[in-house]
């Protein structure tokens, strides 16, 4: 999150979370402006000459939905600046001299989860937009999974799922004759060990996708888990 | 930041061969899409050929197709273009540069966020 400091007792932190593609969706803390104040942050770049966009502030959230031609790239950098008027006048107070979007991902959900039920496993396969294709190998995504009956919190987890979009269940990991449910995240992943920090993409989770149901696949032969029996 | 340095432009007889390098400096090399445009004495800068960023698709403009072959190494933050069976009128300044394909497609300029300076290519008949 980015922190601008308001003038007086005001202070307000600005949080600006982007899908790494053309949207940055911000949210403040601060206390509602006066009526017809309409503030709004501006987002100009310190690389693109000319590259400014508003997100005008609704309540507490904004969103800036960027023109094709200003999709994000991994070494755009902007200034951030919240606009307000006052008495008539335009009041300007910087958030943040350097807004870097890759340091602030929280990527769209995967979409298209799809199951497909074979003898003795379920194989899950997912989308994701072709505009983050080049940065496969960036995704980290996690999965969860239970009987449909249980709560998600009762679900067990699978993550490092890095670089693929495709996952099998093995049959002993799902309670057989039972509908299940599955369900998946994304974040941004950068897992070289030669990456320097300020190289490096950082956020947070994606939302959850929707839920895929699928029957559990009967088991086959006598249940050896891989590991071996203790 | 991404620096483009476009090397390998000269004199060459028509029917000759040059290969041009593209080195980008800073990050992100294998994210990006690399392009070459080129631009002719009193004409406007046109589509060459494109390679995406792992180097697995390449798209060439009909003019230069069968003759012209893009490469690129990501490990030496490099693109190529090699130009074999030159002609007279592909004399021009060639211009590397580097986008994140996303809306647009790789032959347009507008795809591309990062030029380099150009480098002559002259071919004599």
């Known amino acids: 999150s980015v922190t601008g400091e308001g003038q007086g007792p005001r202070s307000r932190t600005f949080t600006c979370l982007t899908n790494n593609i053309l949207r940055i969706d911000c949210h403040w803390s601060a206390p509602e402006l006066g009526q017809g104040s309409s503030p709004w942050l501006l987002f100009t770049s310190n690389q693109a000459p000319g590259g400014t966009h508003k997100c005008i502030l609704r309540g507490s959230e904004c969103t800036v939905v960027l023109p094709p031609e200003a999709v994000l790239v991994p070494s755009d950098n902007f200034t951030i600046t919240f606009h307000h008027c006052m008495s008539g006048r335009e009041q300007v107070s910087l958030v943040d001299p350097e807004y870097l979007p890759r340091r602030h991902v929280k990527l769209d959900p995967p979409s298209d989860l799809q199951s497909n039920i074979s003898s003795g496993h379920c194989i899950l396969t997912w989308s994701i937009s072709p505009a983050l294709e080049p940065m496969t190998t960036l995704l980290s995504y996690e999965l969860a999974f239970k009987k449909q009956e249980e709560a998600w919190e009762q679900a067990q987890h699978r993550d490092h799922i890095v670089g693929v979009t495709w996952l099998i269940l093995e049959a002993f990991e799902l309670d057989p004759g039972f509908i299940h449910e599955a369900r998946l995240r994304v974040q941004m992943a950068t897992l070289e060990d030669d990456v320097v920090e300020e190289e490096r993409y950082t956020g947070q989770w994606s939302e959850w996708s929707q839920p895929v149901c699928f029957q559990a696949p009967q088991r086959q032969g006598p249940l050896i888990p891989p590991w071996g029996w203790p | 930041q991404v620096q483009l340095v476009e090397s390998g432009g000269g004199l060459v007889q028509a029917g000759g061969s040059l290969r041009l390098s593209c080195a980008a400096s800073?990050?992100?090399?294998?994210?990006?899409?690399m392009g070459w445009f080129r631009q002719a004495p009193g004409k406007e800068r046109e589509f060459v050929a494109a390679i995406s960023n792992e180097g697995g698709s390449t798209y060439y403009a009909d003019s230069v197709k069968g003759r012209f072959t893009i490469s690129r190494d990501n490990a030496k933050n490099t693109v190529y273009l090699q130009m074999n069976s030159l002609k007279p009128e592909d004399t021009a300044v060639y211009y590397c540069a580097a986008g994140r394909w996303y809306y647009y497609g790789p032959e347009y300029q507008i795809t591309y966020r990062y030029w380099g300076q150009g480098t002559q290519v002259t071919v004599s008949s």
């Open positions: 800073g990050r992100w090399f294998r994210f990006y899409g």
